[in-house]
Interface confidence: medium
């Protein structure tokens, strides 16, 4: 047993543009409160019942009235921690939902009005007894900063709160086979209290109240010897005496889920998927009605017609599940075209478009060259959401505004000297070479490797490279 503790540090506008409007006004003062829901395991879809580990509601925060014209500040928060007690072992991995609710305190008929301001959800690994874990979550334009930890309630200790500690009976040492309880060195690990009647010779337990059998024994209290004539053997250690597998207890054996819940094994333990109207680690809690507020994310609770269903949640757009606890991943349909980034803001989908594209789904390919001038006779070339200038000779840079140095690349071969010219470059060739870039040797007999020098140009004259 232990307690999950949640400390809300701040709730206010997140960084960046588009600050949210203050949730309260001079005409409608309001105050905040928070709701946390925890469930075991890492899968948000694993259990229909959203709060199998427990849930808690904060106190109401101080009344807040918006100052007209002022930006929304961090809003005043309720005092104290949100505490969610857990009765069994801490699962180590858990999913959380934290909702920020607004209570409007105007002149509503029939009492204050509640509305959901923001909801954040996540999956985390957390060992009990560790330090506060810090977190920042964003919901639309709001930002929630909080910390959380799981701590064991004495006498439980350990990362799952399954080891028990008791004060030492003798001042100097612990009993046989029992270790000191670090860091409480003056205490000893207590023997676990197994299920009543569990065989002390053939059974053992790793968690209070269970009875796990040693090899060769079976039954709820490990008092029945395993028949060696037929090996059923889906699981469990190999038996040295019979040469076959002995069935060991699996976490779902005997179905620990009550009230028609279905059991599925997890790496550490088991998880129950509860029918509507039941929740808890083993679906043992029943009788949920609309008065318990079982619908998350602004879902509308309606009393169920049939006796098995005490309530029905009508979910707002973007949520599903019997308690509206599951967010519909609307971005999985990839609504944003041309590589746009999909953002599910809860109330709406938004596409953040790549450069060169626009529209609600980034479906419009902008004319990259519209309004883009390339200087000095350059021409604009479109491509991939960006524009590029193809520059005239002698110019370079993004917009052809930079004068290029045509000699920078040393274009004249065989020691020829390069001269920048208004329309390009000129190579003055070393003796024995000719051509636009001095690339052709002049033959010893006076004939060149070129077909013929143009009239009026002698081999060795500067050749202008166009």
């Amino acid at each position: 047993a232990g307690v999950f503790e949640l400390q809300i540090h701040s709730f206010g506008p997140g960084p960046g543009p588009g600050a949210p409007r203050s949730p309260c006004s001079a005409r409608l003062p309001c105050r905040l409160f928070f709701r946390v829901c925890l469930k075991p395991g890492l899968s948000e879809e694993a259990a229909e019942s959203p709060c199998a580990l427990g849930a808690a509601l904060s106190a109401r925060g101080p009344v807040y009235t918006e100052q007209p014209g002022a930006p929304a500040p961090d809003l005043p928060l309720p005092d104290g921690l949100l505490q969610v007690p857990f009765r069994d072992a801490w699962p180590g991995t858990f999913s959380f939902i934290i909702e920020t609710w607004r209570e409007e305190l105007g002149d509503q008929i029939g009492g204050p009005a509640w509305s959901l301001l923001a909801r954040v959800a996540g999956r985390r690994r957390l060992a009990a007894g560790g330090p506060w874990a810090r977190d920042i979550q964003r919901a639309g334009a709001w930002e929630l900063r909080f910390s959380y930890r799981a701590r064991c309630e004495p006498p439980a200790v350990g990362t799952a709160c399954t080891r028990l500690c008791r004060p030492r009976s003798a001042p100097s040492r612990c009993g046989p086979g029992l270790r000191p309880c670090a860091p409480l060195e003056d205490e000893c690990e207590a023997p676990l209290v197994c299920r009543a009647g569990c065989s002390p010779e053939h059974g053992f337990c790793e968690q209070p109240g269970e009875c796990r059998c040693l090899e060769g024994w079976t039954g709820p209290l490990c008092t029945v010897p395993v028949s060696t004539s037929s090996c059923l053997s889906p699981r469990g250690p190999s038996s040295a005496t019979t040469g076959c597998l002995v069935p060991g207890p699996g976490p779902c054996d005997g179905n620990p889920c009550a009230n028609g819940g279905s059991c599925s094994e997890t790496p550490r333990s088991f998880e129950c998927t509860c029918p509507r109207g039941f929740y808890g680690l083993r679906c043992e809690v029943s009788g949920v009605t609309c008065a318990d507020g079982p619908c998350f994310n602004g879902g509308l609770c309606v009393g169920g017609a049939d006796p098995d269903s005490a309530y029905i949640c009508h979910c707002p757009p973007g949520f599903q599940g019997s308690n509206c606890e599951k967010r519909v991943d609307r971005c999985s349909l990839q609504p944003c075209r041309n590589g746009g980034l999909c953002l599910d803001l809860g109330h709406a989908l938004r596409c953040r478009c790549r450069a060169g594209f626009a529209g609600p789904r980034c479906e419009h390919d902008l004319d990259d060259c519209a309004g883009r001038a390339c200087a000095n006779g350059g021409t604009c070339v479109e491509g991939g959401g960006a524009h590029r200038c193809s520059c005239a000779l002698g110019f370079g840079g993004r917009d052809c505004r930079e004068r290029a140095d045509p000699c920078a690349a040393r274009p004249c071969a065989h020691g020829g000297r390069c001269y920048a010219h208004f329309s390009g470059l000129v190579c003055a060739c070393a003796p024995g070479y000719m051509g636009a870039r001095c690339e052709f040797p002049v033959h010893p007999d006076g004939a060149s490797a070129l077909p013929a020098a143009p009239p009026g140009l002698r081999p060795g004259d500067p050749q202008r490279y166009l």
Partner: antibody, heavy 121, light 107 residues
Amino acid sequence: QVQLVQSGAEVKKPGASVKVSCKASGYTFTGYYMHWVRQAPGQGLEWMGWINPNSGDTNYAQKFQGRVTMTRDTSISTAYMELSRLTSDDTAVYYCARDANIAALDAFEIWGQGTMVTVSS
Amino acid sequence: DIQMTQSPSSLSASVGDRVTITCRASQSISSYLNWYQQKPGKAPKLLIYAASSLQSGVPSRFSGSGSGTDFTLTISSLQPEDFATYYCQQSYSTPLTFGGGTKVEIK
């Protein structure tokens, strides 16, 4: 009582590494983040990073990324900070500091006595 | 990174004086601000956390205020043991950063 005791002063050559230890006592070592902060002679305080002693997770300041390694040994309630490729600019007093018992507000409640690291050729 | 600017960098005061030190953040840090006192050759000591909460064991003459970007540490009546250097530190986001310090000297 709650205290952090650090290893003794070190003199290192440029390019070498230094490993400073910080032994915790009087509290549950795995229950609080451990931070490392340094202070060059006559200068202000500079945060280097933290380690979660429970999980071993770390968070280093970008400036020290690739040069600093923070580790812990829970069996002896000790945190370590190793800084490599030392230069004269790393001459400083290095402190370990424990998070306050407040919900992860990164306030440094308990400090070690400091370890002077001198880098000189 | 969030820059923290403290002012003044040093001040001279007498025993019994009211002393105010300010700290400004380069962006809003809500109330994620802590104050420390450091004496020569010693490790810093936490005085105030979360902008205005007094750390246990710290005399009530120390107080903190502010939110957002502007914060103040006030010593209502300076005592001989208060002559030291004071640092502010933001814990809104990593890297955690400190102000440059304010040295309080005897006039």
